[in-house]
């Protein structure tokens, strides 16, 4: 079975400046999968924001501007990434990683 | 609500090339992700390429890798598909696509907000 693991405990960034989050995935190959980002603001549910498929397919939530969030994922490390751009106030949050396996 | 429009279809010889465009009106275009299908007679409706929102990533179906390169210009709000080394089984109408929330070749049709009225190609000697 997969597991992930989001080394970085927290991030600080300076507004407007971009936020880099990242996200191991073990125990399976990252290629296979389907990463999914998620957020949590202070006090609000927990919202879906972008995923990266097995084929390579971005799938974002349609309400969040193009240009805010991007995904990617790197077999190499086995690592998924999480941009956030512009970096403003409403972006701090918790930023959680899920692993759907196909 | 957004508006396609494709040109650049005809009549080529196999081996030849044509560049589709695809304009779009009536939102902001850098919103949508773009993608290029096509459709023979009796057919599905088969996905060929994809460009992202920002066109940093691009996709491309097995059958048209390496012969077809797709691009946009979010200045002039149009999506293009270069297509070279064209072949009789090329032979469609194509459409572009737009959707606001999926960006690749696992996109369901119904995961795509708008489309074009298409334009037909024609490989033939």
């Known amino acids: 079975a997969g597991h992930l693991e989001q080394p970085q405990i927290s991030s600080t960034k300076t507004l407007s400046k971009t936020a880099r989050l990242e996200c191991v995935v073990s125990g399976i190959t990252i290629s296979a999968t389907s990463v999914y980002w998620y957020r949590e603001r202070p006090g609000e549910v927990i919202q879906f924001l972008v995923s990266i498929s097995y084929d390579g397919t971005v799938r974002k939530e349609s309400g969040i501007p193009s240009g805010k969030f991007e995904v990617d994922r790197i077999p190499e490390t086995s690592t998924s990434t999480l941009t956030i751009h512009n970096v403003e106030k409403q972006d701090i949050a918790t930023y959680y990683c899920a692993l759907w396996e196909v | 609500e957004v508006q396609l429009v494709e040109s650049g279809g005809g009549l080529v010889q196999p081996g030849g090339s044509l560049r589709l465009s695809c304009a779009a009106s009536g939102s902001i275009f850098s919103n949508y992700a773009m993608a290029w299908f096509r459709q023979a007679p009796e057919k599905e409706r088969d996905f060929l390429a994809a460009v992202s929102w920002s066109g940093g990533r691009t996709y491309y179906a097995d059958s048209v890798k390496g012969r077809f390169t797709i691009s946009r210009d979010n200045a002039k709000n149009t999506v293009n598909l270069q297509m070279n080394s064209l072949k009789p089984e090329d032979t469609a109408v194509y459409y572009c696509?737009?959707?606001?929330?999926?960006?690749?070749?696992?996109?369901?049709?119904?995961?795509?907000?708008?489309w074009g009225q298409g334009t037909q190609v024609t490989v033939s000697s």
């Open positions: 696509a737009a959707s606001l929330s999926c960006s690749g070749p696992g996109c369901s049709l119904e995961e795509y907000d708008y």
